[in-house]
Amino acid sequence: SSSPTSSASSFSSSAPFLASAVSAQPPLPDQCPALCECSEAARTVKCVNRNLTEVPTDLPAYVRNLFLTGNQLAVLPAGAFARRPPLAELAALNLSGSRLDEVRAGAFEHLPSLRQLDLSHNPLADLSPFAFSGSNASVSAPSPLVELILNHIVPPEDERQNRSFEGMVVAALLAGRALQGLRRLELASNHFLYLPRDVLAQLPSLRHLDLSNNSLVSLTYVSFRNLTHLESLHLEDNALKVLHNGTLAELQGLPHIRVFLDNNPWVCDCHMADMVTWLKETEVVQGKDRLTCAYPEKMRNRVLLELNSADLDCDPILPPSLQTS
């Protein structure tokens, strides 16, 4: 066997005393939890599709990539990954598809290197506002998170608590301003009807934002102005009817942006004129030649780029499903 001249679990144990969730015994450098596969050279632990009901306590200290997908964790308590010595190298944590319905405050505390977190495909009925910030202070210590993947975390209708799901998620994103360094945020497939107006302004480092496959009807009250680093904005498969001048100007003003707008029910009436003019001139919309009208009926499947002002008139009556905006 190889001879470690400094054991992989020899991280400093001078960290402050951790809560009771801390596992008492420091793991051996080559220890691998039951029902998991480990590679120290790849710094990876995979505990995949094993129906685990809790996070293993004996995770090796070398772990940088931890896959806990396809399990039955249900609840992620405070300090779920706190260990002594801490998992100081853990950089990527994938908890997707593990039937989590509750993530408590401080669930990801004591992970100083955590850069990527994937909670996708969990029915998160109860996401603590302090899940990512770890404390209820108005300004928390900055989170090291760079990528936060929250696709398809909406619970079934009957499991939702009596509050806005959008509001619950946004509260967790904004608590304590901990996620100021976040560069990628994925919120696809969450039935979002709206985007709270303050959320993007408080995530100034975003490079990639995925809001695809939601139910967004309008971006009128959403400001992209502060997102000067934004490189990709995915808005495919929503319920967008038109983008108005303010939004168009803000998007055009972002220096690196690529916008994806496919499969939205664009309403090609007189309110669409500015967007059509903009589309013909802009380079920021990817696949803009694929965008087609959904309403009114006489305009269905017409390509937006091929429209001119004479095509865009306003009839007094809109389909009932579109009168709620």
Partner: antibody, heavy 125, light 107 residues
């Protein structure tokens, strides 16, 4: 571009010492784990030793245990291999190789993704 | 230590041939396996990681498969630049170990 350049090889008598260096450019050396791998004439590859990005973790093959020491100077962008008590069977081309994992990387582990051109060590009386 | 055994140790093939190289681990290593290509007097080059994932920039004619103890590297249509020696390497645990190599020569 990313480059690893080994130096310090040569002919040395059994029992003597040699220090190899690997000068790094084109990436943030202090973020990457590193390895030394060797290849005896006409033979296959043999992993020798590993060091983590900050020098806190080191691993050696049993064949060099107690004789070879890997180290690094992140301020100089240089990886070292101190070889003591050299034997004829240590004769080989020595490659430094970057581990695909860096301190800031959180994707798959790609193995040893960048290699130097190698430096030849000949142990002979 | 985990021993890696490659076969064949050498083979002769023609341009356009399909070439298969096997690698067997002395104990299960899940998918913690990489493949490298080495040409004479050159440093090795990484081809495949995690048993089947193609390294960026590597032509798609190269593919890897296997899990546990038995692994395969396949070159679907051998090209002139593919004549080289190929090594498997396990990274399930330290010490990292390589197979003995398979030399692919021109028939």
């Amino acid at each position: 571009q990313v480059q690893l350049v080994e130096s310090g090889g040569g002919v040395v008598q059994p029992g003597r010492s040699l220090r190899l260096s690997c000068a790094v450019s084109g990436f943030t050396f202090s973020s990457y784990d590193m390895n030394w791998v060797r290849q005896a004439p006409g033979k296959g590859l043999e992993w020798v030793t590993f060091i983590s990005y900050d020098g806190s973790n080191k691993y050696n093959a049993d064949s060099v245990k107690g004789r070879f020491t890997i180290s690094r100077d992140n301020s100089k962008n240089t990886l070292y291999l101190q070889m003591n008590s050299l034997r004829a069977e240590d004769t080989a081309v020595y490659y430094c190789a970057r581990d695909s994992y860096s301190r800031s990387w959180y994707g798959d582990y790609y193995g040893m993704d960048v290699w130097g051109q190698g430096t030849t060590v000949t142990v002979s009386s | 230590d985990i021993q890696m055994t490659q076969s064949p140790s050498s083979l002769s093939a023609s341009v356009g041939d399909r070439v298969t190289i096997t690698c067997r681990a002395s104990q299960g290593i899940s998918s913690w396996l990489a493949w490298y290509q080495q040409k004479p007097e050159k440093a090795p080059k990484s081809l495949i990681y995690a048993a089947s994932s193609l390294q960026s920039g590597v032509p798609s004619r190269f593919s890897g498969s296997g899990s546990g103890t038995d692994f395969t590297l396949t070159i679907s249509s051998l090209q002139p630049e593919d004549f080289a020696t190929y090594y498997c390497q396990q990274y399930n645990s330290y010490p990292l170990t390589f197979g003995g190599g398979t030399k692919v020569e021109i028939k």
